[in-house]
Interface confidence: medium
């Protein structure tokens, strides 16, 4: 699927648009809001009833090179006594993000946008129980 | 930028870091993954910290539609289906990269933008401060 050309549907394409070769697009990877402050809740990954750990994946041919992934620690959820309750389930919550992938073909380099699915944390859910006839 | 290994047989002109501006193929790899969380799972309803999903649409951005989670309750749902205020529903937030049309309205010129989204909610034990 190609990125929808908004200019064809919502707007007239401005005259000031940079010339771009067919089949490609110009991408500035100087990130807008690069230094925005994240105000995440404190230590929720260990205080959650569905706690999780983090691992960092690193790929030098990806921008950004670091992507943090969460993994649920338990199959069940942690109850008030601090024990795992397997009548409930810890499940991953996922979100898509974009990365830029650099590909080497011989001595030439090309760039490709890629959707990456990131697991951001876990939540505790009531299981769906299927009754077999 | 990030450092990359260079093919030793190639000319030494290539920068180790990602250039500031790149030309990218219009086709996005892994583009067909499901972007509507309401369709992909019903966790938002089944969670002990359930959330509502709000549609955020911006035609100057790709993806133009992003779903934002908002926790339904301050507490968490207990085994009886009631809200337990001894536990807290909190949003799980994530920074993601999107494309912003730059200059505005241009069909094939973008800049990466970092945005903060609430993806879902989780139930946590509150930190209670005992005031002396």
């Amino acid at each position: 699927r190609k990125i929808p050309k908004v200019g064809h549907t919502f707007f007239q394409k401005p005259e000031s648009c940079p010339p771009v070769p067919g089949g490609s697009m110009k991408l500035d990877i100087g990130i807008i809001n690069e230094n925005q402050r994240v105000s995440m809740s404190r230590n929720i990954e260990s205080r959650s009833t569905s706690p999780w750990n983090y691992t960092v994946t690193w790929d030098p041919n990806r921008y950004p090179s670091e992507v943090v992934q969460a993994q649920c620690r338990n199959l069940g959820c942690i109850n008030a006594q601090g024990k795992e309750d397997i009548s409930m389930n810890s499940v991953p919550i996922q979100q898509e993000t974009l990365v830029v992938r650099r590909k080497h073909q011989g001595c030439s380099v090309s760039f490709q946008l890629e959707k990456v699915l990131v697991t951001v944390g876990c939540t505790c859910v009531t299981p769906v129980i299927h009754h077999v006839q | 930028g990030i450092t990359i290994p260079r093919n030793p047989g190639c000319p030494n002109s290539e920068d180790k870091n990602f250039p500031r501006t790149v030309m990218v193929n219009l086709n996005i790899h892994n583009r067909n993954t499901n972007t509507n969380p309401k369709r992909s799972s019903d966790y938002y309803n089944r969670s002990t910290s359930p959330w509502n999903l709000h549609r955020n649409e911006d035609p100057e951005r790709y993806p133009s539609v992003i779903w934002e989670a908002k926790c339904r309750h301050l507490g968490c749902i207990n085994a009886d289906g009631n809200v337990d205020y001894h536990m807290n529903s909190v949003p799980i937030q994530q920074e993601i990269l999107v494309l912003r049309r730059e200059p505005p309205h241009c069909p094939n010129s973008f800049r990466l933008e970092k945005i903060l989204v609430s993806v879902g909610c989780t139930c946590v034990t509150p930190i209670v401060h005992h005031v002396a």
Partner: nanobody, 123 residues
Framework: EVQLVESGGGLVQAGGSLRLSCAAS????????VGWFRQAPGKEREFIGA????????YYAVSEKDRFTISRDNGKNTLYLQMSSLKAEDTAVYYC????????????????WGQGTQVTVSS
Amino acid sequence: EVQLVESGGGLVQAGGSLRLSCAASGRTFSSYVVGWFRQAPGKEREFIGAISGSGDSIYYAVSEKDRFTISRDNGKNTLYLQMSSLKAEDTAVYYCTADQEFGYLRFGRSEYWGQGTQVTVSS
């Protein structure tokens, strides 16, 4: 980052009503739990109530449940406190507060606070 500015305070007769507003700046207002506290002269800061990011869930201090109503408008980035049947003992500075977590907010340890607005109830 969230900035909070309260308004709507003033002098009111006992038995009267007042609506306080708290205007928030910041794009992520709707992901914060927000609430109200008050502090009377010479007293501890007292929790009034809080409302979830979506507005679906509201928690009140039991003593004020019947007279005070908390609401929010995420489109306007504004929190409200509707007070009715006001008494002299409601005289205090009223503070708007916001945090990612209800647990922190409930016990007066929120990340963000407004400057407060004075409410004086005359008998």
